[in-house]
């Protein structure tokens, strides 16, 4: 049986204060720019170094932002979402959905096409090589006795 990759979804309220360089992140998504198929939600695409978000540390690239200051981000055009963030004021409250990758099933048997799974030959080849080296060393040792 192949293992599968599931996601543990958690939500968090993150309160940020705009720094000298702003909140410090970029977004993707919107009804006119779907980032995830069948999902027009707004996602964090990049967190800028030394920005408020980076210094706070909780917001991560790939997080989905559900609301800004209590205002839902569903069914917004991309530019409207950008404008909403830019006009959100000094203190900004973000409702964020984190997706943490969790693996079910036997280790080393992730679902096909999952790039984070380790192919079995990548484990077997080094093990085989080590076995051969050990056997060769053992034979050399025995010959010297």
């Amino acid at each position: 049986m192949n293992g599968r990759v599931d996601y543990l979804v958690t939500e968090e309220e993150i309160n940020l204060t705009r720094g000298p360089s702003g909140l410090g992140f970029n977004i993707v998504g919107g009804t006119d720019q779907q980032y995830v198929s069948n999902d027009s939600g707004i996602y964090v695409s990049r967190i800028k170094e030394n920005g408020a978000a980076a210094l706070d540390g909780r917001l991560q690239e790939g997080d989905k932002i559900l609301s800004v200051n209590g205002q839902d981000l569903k069914n917004l055009l991309h530019q409207d979402a950008v404008d909403l963030f830019r006009n959100a004021g000094y203190a900004v409250s973000l409702r964020v959905q984190h997706r943490l990758q969790v693996q079910n099933g036997p280790i080393g048997h992730r679902g096909e096409g999952d790039p984070s799974g380790i192919p079995i030959f990548m484990v077997l080849v080094p093990v085989f090589a080590l076995t051969m080296v050990a056997a060769w060393a053992f034979m050399r040792y025995r010959q010297q006795l």
Epitope: R18, P20, S21, G22, L23, G24, F25, N26, I27, V28, S45, K48, H78, V82, F85, R86
Partner: nanobody, 120 residues
Framework: DVQLVESGGELVQAGGSLRLSCEAS????????VGWFRQAPGKDREFVGS????????TVVNSVMGRFTIFRDNPKKTVYLQMTSLKVEDTAVYYC??????????????WGQGTQVTVS
């Protein structure tokens, strides 16, 4: 990173016209909003106007409205500030600045070195 180079600044008589250019180093310049700013001697840098990534949103401050316009040519990776009916008080170093269009902030991340405009 995006490098910006302004050009076109010179000495001009009051009532004259100038076109400033802001050329970018990146091939994805069409993904950036661009703002023009100016700094007169002994004064703070002030916002003049901006244009969004696609060119369909443009704004200029009241003091230059009707005299200055901003437009862009994305294939040429260039944004222009067209200045007409120039006044002595328009004398300043003019800067262009860029920010990624999907940034959640108003602040501009990339700045040029500026070009001097002197109106006599």
């Amino acid at each position: 990173d995006v490098q910006l180079v302004e050009s076109g600044g010179e000495l001009v008589q009051a009532g004259g016209s100038l076109r400033l250019s802001c050329e970018a180093s990146t091939g994805t310049f069409g993904d950036y909003d661009v703002g023009w700013f100016r700094q007169a001697p002994g004064k703070d840098r002030e916002f003049v106007g901006s244009i969004n990534w696609s060119g369909d949103r443009r704004t200029v401050v009241n003091s230059v409205m009707g005299r200055f316009t901003i437009f862009r040519d994305n294939p040429k990776k260039t944004v222009y500030l067209q200045m007409t009916s120039l006044k002595v008080e328009d004398t300043a170093v003019y800067y262009c600045a860029a920010r990624f269009r999907s940034s959640v902030d108003w602040q501009y991340d990339y700045w040029g070195q500026g070009t001097q405009v002197t109106v006599s």
